[in-house]
């Protein structure tokens, strides 16, 4: 696992950053775990970063992710509606200069090094559930969420609204 101290060092610097001229509403350093309390961890392998979903040993420290929250206009999907809505989007960065990206072609979630402004693939619409879990919907592909598949993060198409609460797209954010 990597990036814990690195993230904390650059949290302050990110406060001054802007993405296409928009500053984040807030930033939050948190560990990310699944609905079933498995941890999301990040490891350097063969010069690229891998993302794992795993049970941590008792005293093993959780990796932290910097979530940056942005406000965006919510495009109404019904003609004639008043376009009054806003949505919250987040970017997720486990270490300096690296962000989670949606690879819609491969249905995968990847860590990419990139400069500002970040591409749309790095933005996820945040949903919070009655269970106080959250889910992350791809900005570039509405109806597709970050989820867990075979101990990895993957992009999962939520076919019907009834499946919005399906456990494999629910995550917990924790400061500890």
């Amino acid at each position: 696992a990597f990036g814990i101290s690195g993230v904390q060092k650059y949290t302050r610097a990110l406060h001054d950053s802007s993405i296409t001229g928009i500053s984040p509403i807030t930033e939050y350093l948190a560990s990310l775990s699944t609905y079933n309390d498995q941890s999301i961890t990040f490891a350097l392998e063969d010069e690229s970063y891998e993302i794992y979903v795993e049970d941590l040993k008792k005293d093993e420290k959780k990796d932290k992710v910097l979530l940056s929250y942005y406000e965006s206009q919510h495009p109404s999907n019904e003609s004639g509606d008043g376009v009054d809505g806003k949505m919250l989007m987040v970017t997720l960065s486990p270490t300096k200069d690296f962000w989670l990206h949606a690879n819609n072609k491969e249905h995968s979630v990847e860590l990419h090094k990139c400069e500002k402004p970040l591409p749309d693939q790095a933005f996820f619409v945040l949903h919070n559930m009655h269970s106080n879990c959250v889910s992350f919907e791809c900005k570039t592909d509405p109806g597709v969420f970050i989820g867990v598949k075979d101990n990895h993060l993957a992009l999962i198409k939520v076919d019907s609204s009834e499946n919005l609460c399906t456990e494999n797209i629910l995550f917990k954010l924790s400061e500890t």
Epitope: H74, N77, D81, G82, G85, M87, H127
Partner: antibody, heavy 122, light 107 residues
Amino acid sequence: EVQLVQSGAEVKKPGASVKVSCKASGYTFSDYNMNWVRQAPGQGLESIGDINPKNADTFYNQNFKDRATLTIDKSTSTAYLELSSLRSEDTAVYYCARHYYYGSSYGGFVYWGQGTLVTVSS
Amino acid sequence: DIQMTQSPSSLSASVGDRVTITCHASQNINVWLSWYQQKPGKNPKLLIYAASKLHTGVPSRFSGSGSGTDFTLTISSLQPEDFATYYCQQGQSYPLTFGQGTKVEIK
């Protein structure tokens, strides 16, 4: 223009039930949770719970878990609150309210209905 | 549940005064706090969301600040139409909870 229009005032006897409606217009009904909040005379605001119109997933505040039922009718973009086993302390104005953010409660309630006064008296 | 505690519960002030209302959350809610104004017989109106963001159409004399557990609503120069009751509300986690309200009265 977004509007939440509630049904009219009700007078009920203790032990009866009441059903309050909230008709939404001006936005995509299924995109935002519908919340219900009540306010007893001279008192503060108290959350009853909310419903996600996409999948009818509900959350009830502990105080209302046994007596409140939240439902929706997607065909008419209407949300309903039914409160059973009414007692005098349920006398209050009941409001429906829509979240500010799509998919999230974090931004509070931006649109409110005009309120429905429910009076419980024998 | 997250408890929201507002203070004071009421205050008397004059037109032109600077008024400050505080709200304390029993646990960290980041910036996910909203402020509402309510006048007698009317529904609440959103003033501030995300702790400091002014809702559309709200006069700039209203401002909000804070994060974590402690938040403030400030009215820089009280106007006659500002005499009302003000509520804070956390949106971070269910159940969503309100402060008990602060009534701003004419001195």
